[in-house]
Interface confidence: low
C-alpha cells in the first residue's frame, strides 16, 4: 500500500517566494524619474523576477526630524498622488505582486523614530496601518526598530491591527542588530512577525561560520517562519565581494523561509563601482545610459539589459532560482537538514514527503575542494543517494541535468551546486 501523504502546511503568500525592496524610488527608476506612475511601468520586470512581494518606500511626507511635518497618511508629492498609488496597487494585484508599504516615520532624518516623541509617533503609525489596510496594501515594513523604545510591545500592537484586518496581511520589522539574543527577544513576543536583520552579514564569508549561523538561527527560532537577507535595507554588495554573490543567491533562495532582496541584488549592483553614488541607494543600472555621470563607467554586463541577454549572468541565475523556489514543494516548505561536507563547505538537504528532494553544496573558499558529504549526520528520512542530478551550478561549464556521483563531488572556488534527487521509500 502506498505510504500516506504528509499533510501540507498552511501557506501564506510570503511563504511562496522572494520579496523585493525598493527603498528609493528615484534611485530605482533613475534619469530624474522616480514616481509611482513610473514604478507601475516596471512591474513587468518584477514579474520576470518571479518575486511575490514588493516592499515599497517609505513614500510618505516627512520633513527631516520634524514630527509635526511627518504625515504617514500622505504620499510625498514628489512620488505622486494617492490615485497613482491606487493605480499601482491595482496593476500589481493583476500581476500577483503584493505591495508592502514601509512606514518608518522619520526616514529622511537622524533618528527614524523621533526618540523624544515615541507615543505621538506610535499613534501616527496605528492610524496609518488602519488607513493603508483599507486602501488595499498587503502589509507593512518598519525599520530601525532598535531605535524604537519598547519595540516589542509596539510591534505586538501593530501586528494585532494588521492580522486583525486579515491573516493574509504581513508585518515586517527591520533591525540593524546582528545579535541573536536581541533578535530572539523581538521575535518572542511577536508570532508571525517577519524580521530582517544584519544577522547573516557577519558570516565572515566562510562555510563553517555561515553554517553555524544558519543552524543556530533555525534551532533557536524553532518551527517559526524566518526571512533571509544580509541586512534590513542594504545591497548584498555592501557585505559581499563579487565572487560570493552567486553563492549567497543560491543559499538565500534555498534556505527555509522567505528570501528578501534589495533592488539591484539580482544584477550585483555595487555602489562602489559608481563614483558619487550613495552606498545605501545607488542608481539602478537598467542599461548603459543609466549612469551618465562618467562615460564608460558602466559596461553592458553590469546592467539589466546586458544580463537579460546572457544566460550565464547573475540575473539569469536569480530568475532560475526564484522560479524553482516558487514551485518546488521541498523548497517551498520542506524540512531542512545541514550536514558536514568538509572544511570551507556548507551543505544541506531540503525535502518534503515524497516530493523531489534538493541537495545544496556551497564552497565559500577560494580553492577547489572535494566534498566529503557525511550522510551519517542525516536522519533516516533524509538519506543521500549515490547520485543526484545537477539542476544548476553557480559557475559556468558544468553539464546541467547530468547525474553526479556524490562520493566524488568536486567544487570549484566559490561554486555552489543545486542537485535534485527523487524520494526513495
Amino acid at each position: 500500500r502506498a505510504p500516506r501523504c504528509r499533510e501540507l502546511p498552511a501557506q501564506k503568500w510570503w511563504h511562496t517566494g522572494a520579496l523585493y525592496r525598493i527603498g528609493d524610488l528615484q534611485a530605482f527608476q533613475g534619469h530624474g524619474a522616480g514616481n509611482l506612475a513610473g514604478l507601475k511601468g516596471r512591474l513587468d520586470y518584477l514579474s520576470s523576477l518571479k518575486v511575490k512581494g514588493l516592499v515599497l518606500g517609505p513614500i510618505h511626507k516627512n520633513q527631516k526630524d520634524d514630527v509635526a511635518q511627518t504625515d504617514l497618511l500622505q504620499i510625498d508629492p514628489n512620488f505622486g498622488s494617492k490615485e497613482d498609488f491606487d493605480s499601482l496597487l491595482q496593476s500589481a494585484k493583476k500581476k500577483s505582486i503584493r505591495v508592502i508599504l514601509d512606514l518608518t516615520p522619520n526616514y529622511r532624518g537622524e533618528n527614524s523614530w523621533f526618540s523624544t516623541q515615541v507615543d505621538t509617533v506610535a499613534t501616527k503609525v496605528k492610524d496609518a496601518l488602519e488607513f493603508w489596510l483599507q486602501a488595499g496594501v498587503d502589509g507593512f515594513q518598519v525599520r530601525d526598530i532598535e531605535n524604537l523604545k519598547d519595540a516589542s510591545s509596539f510591534l505586538a500592537e501593530w501586528q494585532n491591527i494588521t492580522k486583525g484586518f486579515s491573516e493574509d496581511r504581513l508585518l515586517i520589522a527591520g533591525t540593524n542588530s546582528s545579535d541573536l539574543q536581541q533578535i530572539l527577544s523581538l521575535l518572542e513576543s511577536n508570532k508571525d512577525l517577519l524580521l530582517t536583520s544584519s544577522y547573516l552579514s557577519d558570516s565572515g564569508s566562510t562555510g563553517e561560520h555561515t553554517k553555524s549561523l544558519v543552524t543556530q538561527y533555525l534551532n533557536a527560532t524553532g518551527n517559526r517562519w524566518c526571512s533571509w537577507s544580509l541586512s534590513q535595507a542594504r545591497l548584498l554588495t555592501s557585505f559581499l565581494p563579487a565572487q560570493l554573490l552567486r553563492l549567497y543567491q543560491l543559499m538565500l533562495f534555498t534556505l527555509p523561509g522567505t528570501p528578501v532582496f534589495s533592488y539591484g541584488d539580482e544584477i550585483g549592483l555595487d555602489a562602489a563601482a559608481l563614483p558619487g553614488q550613495p552606498m545605501e541607494a545607488p542608481v539602478m543600472l537598467w542599461d548603459e545610459s543609466s549612469f551618465p555621470d562618467i562615460p564608460g563607467a558602466v559596461s553592458a554586463n553590469m546592467t539589466v539589459k546586458g544580463q537579460s541577454e546572457d544566460p550565464g549572468s547573475l540575473l539569469s541565475l536569480f530568475r532560475r532560482l526564484s522560479d524553482q523556489r516558487s514551485k518546488e514543494r521541498s523548497l517551498l516548505h520542506g524540512d531542512f537538514h545541514a550536514f558536514s561536507a568538509g572544511p570551507g563547505l556548507f551543505s544541506y538537504i531540503r525535502h518534503w514527503d515524497q516530493n523531489e528532494r534538493f541537495l545544496v553544496v556551497l564552497n565559500f573558499g577560494d580553492v577547489g575542494l572535494s566534498a566529503g558529504l557525511q550522510a551519517s549526520d542525516l536522519p533516516a528520512s533524509a538519506s543521500l543517494p549515490a547520485k543526484a542530478d545537477l539542476l544548476l551550478s553557480t559557475q559556468p561549464g558544468r553539464e546541467e541535468g547530468s547525474p553526479l556521483e556524490l562520493e566524488r563531488l568536486k567544487l570549484e572556488p566559490h561554486e555552489g551546486l543545486l542537485l535534485r534527487f527523487p524520494y526513495a521509500a
Epitope: 544584519s198 552579514s201 557577519d202 565572515g204 564569508s205 566562510t206 555592501s238 557585505f239 565581494p241 563579487a242 565572487q243 555602489a271 562602489a272 563601482a273 563614483p275 552606498m279 563607467a297 559596461s299 553590469m302 573558499g365 577560494d366 572556488p413 566559490h414
Partner: antibody, heavy 114, light 107 residues
Framework: QVQLEESGPGLVATSQSLSITCTVS????????VHWVRQPQGKGLEWLGV???????IYNSGLMSRLSISKDNSKSQVFLKKNSLQTDDTAMYYC????????SSYAMDYWSQG | DIQMTQSPASLSASVGETVTITCRAS??????LTWYQQKPGKSPQLLVY???TLADGVPSRFSGSGSGTQYSLKINSLQPEDFGSYYC?????????FGGGTKLEIK
Amino acid sequence: QVQLEESGPGLVATSQSLSITCTVSGFSLTNCGVHWVRQPQGKGLEWLGVIWPNGITIYNSGLMSRLSISKDNSKSQVFLKKNSLQTDDTAMYYCARGGHYGSSSYAMDYWSQG
Amino acid sequence: DIQMTQSPASLSASVGETVTITCRASGNIHNYLTWYQQKPGKSPQLLVYTAKTLADGVPSRFSGSGSGTQYSLKINSLQPEDFGSYYCQHFWNTPYTFGGGTKLEIK
C-alpha cells in the same frame, strides 16, 4: 607567489607629471583590484585610488582632478599618472593588491616595496 | 567621507606586555576595518581584515575586535618584532581612508 613591483622615475620636477608602473605576478588583474597608496616621509598612509577587475577606477575625491589609474591586463601592469606635481606630492608610492576573489577582499593583502 | 581617528599616536611598552590600539570611525563602517603593521623602511603588511579575521601567518597574539564605529587591535605578550607603526583603514565606502597611525616603541 604574489608580487607587485614598481618602476618609475625617482625624481620629477615641480609642475611636471609623474608616471609609475606596477607590474604584478602570481595573480591576474582580471580577478583582483589594485590600489595605490602614498606615504610622505615620516607621515601616515593616504589612499589614492583603486582600479577594479572590471576596469572601473575610483579616486580619492581630494586628488581626483590630477590623478589617473589605468591598466593592461595582458601585460599584468597597472599605471598611475599624476599631473602638475607639487612639492607636497613627495612621498613613497605603493601599489597593493585588493579586491581579491577570496576571503580578504576587503583588505590590501600584498604590497609593493614602494 | 568617513574619517578614521586612531589612538594613541604613540605608545611605548616592554616585551611581554599587552597593548591595545583603538580606531574610531566618523560613521558606522559595519566591521569593514583592516589593520596593518609597518616596520621602518618597509611597506605595510596586512594583519587583520573585516575587524577580527587574522590574515594568513599572523601570530595569534594579535586580535581585532569592535563594531559600528569603535574598533581595537590588541597585542598580547609583546615580542621584539612587534615594534613599528600600526594603521587602521576602513573599506566601507570610498575613499578608503586610513587612521593617522600608532607608533609602538620599546620602553
